[in-house]
């Protein structure tokens, strides 16, 4: 089958600081040197691009300075971290991988990771 399979965890719980990390792994049908990874958020049938980065195999992922995502790569595996999450950001986060160079191009889309975000309870006032 000429397709690229992308695997990612089904569920991740964000930390109390609003940080969620997950691994996006792809089975490359070709020997790509340039890869683009995009994180998409699907909620209520609306899809928005959360962040995207293009990297050369063996090099680090570089997201834009104002991106809420950071990541590292190791072979056909990308470790993604999304920060600044709040309860309203709960949703399905889909990993999209594209093998950009050399040709042929391949597209792979994961099934998504459901990220649950719970806003921390405000600390009660202390009487001293």
């Amino acid at each position: 089958c000429k397709a690229m399979h992308v695997a990612q965890p089904a569920v991740v719980l964000a930390s109390s600081r609003g940080i969620a990390s997950f691994v996006c792994e792809y089975a490359s049908p070709g020997k790509a040197t340039e890869v683009r990874v995009t994180v998409l958020r699907q909620a209520d049938s609306q899809v928005t691009e959360v962040c995207a980065a293009t990297y050369m195999m063996g090099n680090e992922l570089t997201f834009l300075d104002d991106s809420i995502c950071t990541g590292t790569s190791s072979g056909n595996q990308v470790n993604l971290t999304i920060q600044g999450l709040r309860a309203m950001d709960t949703g399905l986060y889909i990993c999209k991988v594209e093998l950009m160079y050399p040709p042929p191009y391949y597209l792979g889309i994961g099934n998504g990771t459901q990220i649950y975000v719970i806003d921390p309870e405000p600390c009660p006032d202390s009487d001293f």
Epitope: C1, K2, A3, V47, T54, M100, Y106
Partner: antibody
Framework: QVQLVESGGGVVQPGRSLRLSCAAS????????MHWVRQAPGKGLEWVAV????????HYADSVKGRFTISRDNYKKTVSLQVNSLRAEDTAVYYC???????????WGQGTLVTVSS | EIVLTQSPGTLSLSPGERATLSCRAS???????LAWYQQKPGQAPRLLIY???SRATGIPDRFSGSGSGTDFTLTISRLEPEDFAVYYC?????????FGPGTKVDIK
Amino acid sequence: QVQLVESGGGVVQPGRSLRLSCAASGFTFSSYGMHWVRQAPGKGLEWVAVIWYDGSNKHYADSVKGRFTISRDNYKKTVSLQVNSLRAEDTAVYYCARGGIWGYFDSWGQGTLVTVSS
Amino acid sequence: EIVLTQSPGTLSLSPGERATLSCRASPSISSSYLAWYQQKPGQAPRLLIYGASSRATGIPDRFSGSGSGTDFTLTISRLEPEDFAVYYCHQYGSSPFTFGPGTKVDIK
């Protein structure tokens, strides 16, 4: 709403060149791959070329490789197809199409007709 | 290169009838990356189905897609007068991106 408008078609002699353009509006242009697809009179659809995101990666159909060049200007929101060494078999309606977020071609222009004839 | 073959080449039916269009991929492809388009004379193609079975926005529910691997099907449950057109399958999972030769659905 998404709009793609092609221009630049016309009648041209074999061996000559033409530059096709596609003006985009209604979406974040730099976030999408842009394709050219052609259709010869009475025939089916044939994918021609794609240019990705920042323009650094381009892929072509074997039938046009070395003769056609795709480019984009993300500031002007335009994608162009420079068609050189034209042959009779290049006669077709040339469509500009957006590669959607999931990869399929979700928006198409109305097309521009290129006729190669002596 | 992934080759898509469509059958039949022409389908002659009456309004209200059911249309079943076939698309075969060689080698096999993931259903995530198969789309169907409708094209009427003098118009650009219009996306109907993506991911083999998901209807595009604004497409009536009489259009449905199914299939996996090598065999895919587009079904029009009850043909309306505006459905008589040419239908193309398309794979977008790898380059070169390819289209089937099309199936023409015409009025009997």
